[in-house]
């Protein structure tokens, strides 16, 4: 699996989409999880309703949120009051019995607020986004990143 | 095996700018974040900061005002430059992965202020 | 910042013996807490993650807890090779801060 990029502004929320094909994952509940360590496991974080059909019934577990259409295909994590420790590997997941597929990659990357002035202008430097080999860059927008776009206006 | 390695001047003079180049080996740059740490001799270790997958950076405030990091990904290696250096700036300099901790380090290189 | 603070500053102990190192947090860093050893003349080597996580390769005699804002190393027996300086390191807030380190040395 290839790894895609979601950037989010400390306080903010970030809303993270994994797409996937509807009819191959038909009937499954999906989770998020948080990769603990390059060959540790995957330690779930939240998932979608226990009842499938229910899966677009919003659920959260402290401020992270999952919800599922399941027609159109496309699982949706919202990240609230986003924080540093937030930065981190996660995976998209379609459960089946005690198993789980992952649907996508997600490395989170949080930003200082450049209008916090309390410490951001400390800590916060614009760099250059670019196009890697293994790793696709969207807004928390979920906007795709073009090649030298830059993420945040740079600040004077 | 994921391997760091620092290079760069060991001697740099006061109030010119300490260039250092991180070399990953064994793994692909991309989709991690990689931070720059130092430790005066004798002293306890202060991080200066990260930079992302997609280039942008975090920097300690005690730097921020000295420091740039940036990224190649085309050479899988990323960079620390500090300027106006002083004496206080005398360290060991050491670059390591930053995703699940610090789970890789350089085996750091000795940077020091002299004229 | 985050000021950790680690004590005792040094730890005199025999091998075999049980080592006990403390890091205190000034504030809440949930369990975004990391421990490293560092050995003379060697990078730091993470030893545990989020507070009580070993990480890939580390002995069993090596244990973290929490409690609060109090973290605590635990070396159950040390052996020789444990004789280092440990730092703990917090990734709750920026910017990551360490603990001025313990020293375990041979009594």
């Known amino acids: 699996h290839n790894t895609t990029v979601f950037q989010g502004v400390a306080g903010q929320s970030l809303q993270v989409s994994c797409p996937y094909d509807s009819m191959k994952h038909w009937g499954r509940r999906k989770a998020w999880c948080r990769q603990l360590g390059e060959k540790g496991p995957c330690q779930r974080v939240v998932s979608t309703h226990n009842l499938w059909l229910l899966s677009f019934l919003r659920r959260w577990n402290g401020s992270t949120a999952i919800t599922d259409d399941t027609l159109g295909g496309t699982l949706t994590i919202t990240l609230r009051n986003l924080q540093p420790h937030d930065a981190g590997l996660y995976q998209c997941q379609s459960l089946h019995g005690s198993e789980a597929d992952t649907l996508r990659k997600v490395l989170v990357e949080v930003l200082a607020d450049p209008l916090d002035h309390r410490d951001a202008g400390d800590l916060w430097f614009p760099g250059e986004s670019e196009s890697f080999e293994d790793a696709h860059v969207e807004h928390s927008i979920s906007r795709s990143l073009l090649e030298g776009e830059i993420p945040f206006p740079p600040t004077s | 095996q994921v391997q760091l390695q620092e290079s760069g001047p060991g001697l740099v003079k006061p109030s010119e700018t300490l260039s250092l180049t991180c070399t990953v080996s064994?793994?692909?740059?991309?989709?991690?974040?990689w931070s720059w740490i130092r430790q005066p001799a004798g002293k306890g270790l202060e991080w200066i900061g990260l930079?992302?997958?997609?280039?942008?950076?975090i920097y300690n405030p005690s730097v921020k005002r000295r420091v740039t990091m940036s990224v190649d990904t085309s050479k899988n290696q990323f960079s620390l430059k500090l300027t106006s250096v002083t004496a206080a700036d005398t360290a060991v300099y050491y670059c390591?992965?930053?995703?699940?901790?610090?789970?890789?380090w350089g085996q750091g290189t000795l940077v020091t202020v002299s004229s | 910042e985050i000021v950790l603070t680690q004590s005792p500053a040094t730890l005199s102990l025999s091998p075999g013996e049980r080592a006990t190192l403390s890091c205190r947090a000034s504030?809440?860093?949930?369990?975004?807490l990391a421990w490293y050893q560092q050995r003379p003349g060697q990078a730091p080597r993470l030893l545990i993650s989020?507070?009580?996580n070993r990480a890939t390769g580390i002995p069993a005699r090596f244990s973290g807890s929490e409690s609060g804002t109090d973290f605590t190393l635990t070396i159950s027996s040390l052996e020789p090779e444990d004789f280092a300086v440990y730092y703990c390191?917090?990734?709750?807030?920026?910017?990551?801060?360490f603990g001025q380190g313990t020293k375990v040395e041979i009594k």
């Open positions: 930079i992302y997958t997609s280039g942008s950076t």
């Open positions: 989020d507070a009580s």
């Open positions: 390191q917090q990734r709750s807030n920026w910017p990551w801060t």
């Open positions: 064994g793994g692909s740059i991309s989709s991690y974040y």
């Open positions: 504030q809440s860093v949930s369990s975004y």
């Open positions: 390591a992965r930053d995703l699940f901790y610090f789970d890789y």
